[in-house]
């Protein structure tokens, strides 16, 4: 009897949908695996007789529930199927946006870039998929614990009237208000402000 794959799960970030599993202990030799998806009531092969423990399902429709399954094989024997259901638009993890930061005197000028999507045109981003897409920004003085959060209305934001000659750190994430779903924070970007622009009278 061939044991089934273990710890079967979907790892999906920005619609890069990778079905992953672990190979069970099997004394007779090396196992191979076949992964399938349900399409119009028929299961279709996606990865056949692979020695890998993952299979790329990024070409699935972003919409709807998908049934995926994987089994282990050895010679002419095979395990039972292990099934999972997956809805990309609901289940995919929102990866960190890009961010460009520029210091202008005592201000930080930030521009945000929505995450790109696997198997899409360069210009079709997570912002196109989710109508309610917005950004959360948090910033803090480097070396302090107090963080401030803002929700920019646009793809850019300016933090004004900051303390001069002080290092501020900023990070951004995508947020979907209608789903109350937050994405992953970007890596902090830390920049030092320069002089206060106000001219003494």
């Amino acid at each position: 009897m061939v044991p089934p794959p273990e710890n079967v799960r979907m790892n999906s970030v920005n619609f890069k949908n990778i079905l992953q599993w672990e190979s069970p202990a099997f004394a007779k030799g090396n196992l191979t695996f076949t992964a399938q998806y349900l399409s119009y009531r028929i299961f279709q092969d996606k990865c056949m007789n692979t020695t890998l423990t993952e299979c790329d399902f990024s070409s699935l429709s972003k919409y709807g529930d998908h049934t995926l399954r994987v089994r282990a094989e050895f010679a002419d024997e095979h395990s039972d199927w292990v099934n999972i259901t997956f809805c990309p638009v609901d289940d995919t993890i929102i990866g960190p946006p890009g961010m460009q930061v520029e210091v202008l005197a005592d201000s930080l000028h930030m521009r945000f870039l929505a995450p790109k999507i696997e198997n899409e045109y360069e210009t079709w981003t997570m912002k196109n998929v989710y109508n309610s897409w917005t950004y959360n920004v948090q910033y803090w003085k480097n070396g302090t614990d107090e963080k401030f959060q803002i929700t920019p209305q646009y793809d850019f934001e300016v933090l004004r009237n900051l303390e001069p000659w002080t290092t501020y750190c900023v990070q951004v994430r995508g947020f979907l208000p209608d789903r109350n779903k937050a994405g992953e924070w970007s890596e902090p970007v830390c920049e030092q402000t320069t002089h206060d622009e106000t001219v003494p009278s």
């Epitope: 070409s59 972003k62 919409y63 198997n119 045109y121 196109n128 998929v129 109508n131």
Partner: nanobody
Framework: EVQLVESGGGLVQPGGSLRLSCAAS????????IGWFRQAPGKGLEGVSC????????HYADSVKGRFTISRDNSKNTLYLQMNSLRAEDTAVYYC?????????????????WGQGTQVTVSS
């Protein structure tokens, strides 16, 4: 059942132009996303371009950027693909497709309705 009907294909010399049209028979083309795909002889389906209804944004494959322009005329319920500076490698059957959910642009899996296609041949 929605039927999409493409027209405007034909034989054109390299460097020439064509304008493809797509209409929905008896229906409006009021879908969140409408796109053009193509299939060259012996190859798979390839996304060419799409237009999003929500913000009228247009999106293109790298291979056609700057040469092809997608547009829609809501008053005529028609989608267009203006193809300029055509090359031999643009030879394919071109399909119009519409998505009910509008979540994707390039992947054929994200589209629900398809036309029968119109042949474009670029040859001297």
């Amino acid at each position: 059942e929605v039927q999409l009907v493409e027209s405007g294909g034909g034989l054109v010399q390299p460097g020439g132009s064509l304008r493809l049209s797509c209409a929905a028979s008896g229906n409006s083309l009021d879908y969140p996303t409408i796109g053009w795909f193509r299939q060259a002889p012996g190859k798979g389906l390839e996304g060419v371009s799409c237009i999003s209804a929500s913000d009228a944004s247009t999106h293109y494959a790298d291979s056609v950027k700057g040469r092809f322009t997608i547009s829609r005329d809501n008053s005529k319920n028609t989608l267009y693909l203006q193809m300029n500076s055509l090359r031999a490698e643009d030879t394919a059957v071109y399909y119009c497709a519409a998505s009910l959910h509008g979540l994707g642009c390039k992947s054929e899996a994200d589209y629900d309705y398809w036309g029968q296609g119109t042949q474009v041949t670029v040859s001297s």
